[in-house]
């Protein structure tokens, strides 16, 4: 696995062990907590990222309305079970026998059950609407400038494949960025929107994973782009199945 | 060359808690993993742990995570293992080893449990 | 955890045969899989990583392949001096874990 050889470091994930005994005598990075060797060249998995966090030493509207399928991460932080491939397993359980299901973002998409609860496939989160409010500034940032720069953003910092950005909706002072992947889009060493989500998440809390790097100084031609709220809204190929109790 | 030398053997009481070490020479001690593993006579071996000596980031089975406890001592290049409430089902060899894939071996330290 | 299933337990052999150890990981484990020798009261020693790769020092009599889930280690032309124990090890996620070893005989 790629990793900074002179010292031995993984660039994209600082929640990582490197040493010089990978294949070949390289420099092998694990994530902590699963001790999975990952890939620095490119994101590690959200669910990877997870584990570790959790052992770390711890009108003409042009907004989207999200429709009624749409998931949030209300649940927050779990120690996540992981495939060797770094994915979400389709259920998760805690320590208690409480089992689940979730998406490929690893957001909860069933009722809580017991460990009797089945879920059949690991169902791909398709499409991703980032819903951001900016700090006040003098004036509205211009439209095509912003959209730019957060394309930009995502193409290189997060190594996003352009055409997965859909669309950069802005009415200030919300920004909704919509990032969507189908399966049979996503080829092999594509990043995954859900990761990549998770990462820009995680940058704009000012708890970037990258290692090293300064945290995420966004600018539209010049001026600060500072995010005072995140909202992250999850839609899947197949709608979530909750109890009628839970919807009201 | 690289050398993982082990501390004497050790006869303890049930209960009682023993410290094994393990003092490594001949390469740098912060940038590679010590494992310690476990053999009882005849068997298999087992692995109990793992540490990293730059962070002392520290991995264990869940078999041994209550009363194995892994550290080290940069300045001296030895790693350690305290077993606390040993029971004769912990009487084996108990080996530390260094890397992922577990290039070099201590020569092994014989615990026995035994009132 | 990660299972490792290592077969046959025990094998018979006659110094000058060839012969393969199998090792089938619970789940793929890529080519993180180690092999390793022991004799009576003997630390153990490596002899191939990475599934496939030599280490310095080992005959070249000894040879290791697969990827995934199933893997070969191989002694081309077996010696006296080959005979004990032989046990895979995966590192390709915490916790480690070994097989339970194929004891190498002499028939």
């Known amino acids: 696995h790629t990793a900074a050889q002179d010292n031995c470091t993984c660039p994209t994930n600082k929640m990582t062990v490197c040493s010089p005994d990978g294949p070949g005598g390289r420099c092998q990075c694990r994530a902590l907590g699963s001790g999975v060797a990952v890939d620095c060249s490119t994101l590690t998995s959200k669910c990877l990222l997870l584990k570790a966090r959790m052992s770390a030493p711890k009108n003409a509207r042009t907004l989207v309305r999200p429709n009624e399928h749409a998931l949030v991460d209300n649940d927050g932080l779990y120690d996540p079970d992981c495939d060797p491939e770094g994915r979400f397993k389709a259920r998760q359980c805690n320590q208690t026998s409480v089992c689940w299901c979730v998406n490929s973002v690893g957001v909860r998409r069933t009722d809580k059950g017991d460990l009797s609860l089945r879920c059949d496939e690991l169902v791909r989160t398709h499409h991703i609407l980032i819903d951001l409010r900016h700090r006040p500034t003098a004036g509205a940032f211009n439209h095509s400038d912003l959209d730019a720069e957060l394309r930009r953003l995502f193409r290189e910092r997060y190594r996003l494949h352009p055409k997965f950005v859909a669309a950069v909706h802005y009415e200030q002072p919300t920004i909704q960025i919509e990032l969507r992947q189908n399966t049979s889009q996503k080829a092999a060493g594509d990043v995954d929107i859900g990761d990549a989500a998770y990462y820009f998440e995680r940058d704009v809390k000012g708890e970037s994973l990258f290692q090293g790097r300064g945290g995420l100084d966004l600018r539209v031609r010049g001026e600060p782009l500072q995010v005072e709220r995140t909202l992250i809204y999850y839609l899947d190929e197949i709608p979530p199945k909750f109890s009628m109790k839970r919807l009201t | 060359q690289v050398q993982l030398q082990q501390s004497g053997a050790e006869l303890v009481r049930p209960g009682a808690s023993v410290k094994l070490s393990c003092k490594a020479s001949?390469?740098?001690?912060?940038?590679?993993?010590i494992n310690w593993v476990k053999q009882r006579p005849g068997q298999g071996l087992e692995w109990i742990g793992n540490i990293f000596p730059s962070g002392s980031y520290t991995n264990y089975n869940q078999k041994f995570k209550d009363r194995a406890t892994l550290t080290v001592d940069k300045s001296s290049s030895t790693a350690f293992m305290q077993l606390s409430s040993p029971t004769s089902e912990d009487s084996a060899i108990y080996f530390c080893?260094?890397?992922?894939?577990?290039?070099?071996w201590g020569q092994g330290t014989t615990l026995t449990v035994s009132s | 955890d990660i299972v490792l299933t290592q077969s046959p337990a025990t094998l018979s052999v006659t110094p000058g045969d060839s012969v393969s150890l199998s090792c089938r990981a619970s789940?793929?484990?890529?080519?993180?899989l180690h092999w390793y020798q022991q004799k009576s009261h003997e630390s153990p020693r490596l002899l191939i990583k990475?599934?496939?790769q030599s280490i310095s020092g080992i005959p070249s009599r000894f040879s290791g392949s697969g990827s995934g889930t199933d893997f070969t280690l191989s002694i081309n032309s077996v010696e006296t001096e080959d005979f004990g124990m032989y046990f895979c090890q995966q590192s390709n996620s915490w916790p480690f874990t070994f097989g339970s070893g194929t004891k190498l005989e002499i028939k």
């Open positions: 080893t260094r890397g992922s894939g577990f290039d070099y």
């Open positions: 789940q793929s484990i890529s080519n993180n």
């Open positions: 990475y599934a496939s």
């Open positions: 001949g390469y740098t001690f912060t940038s590679y993993w």
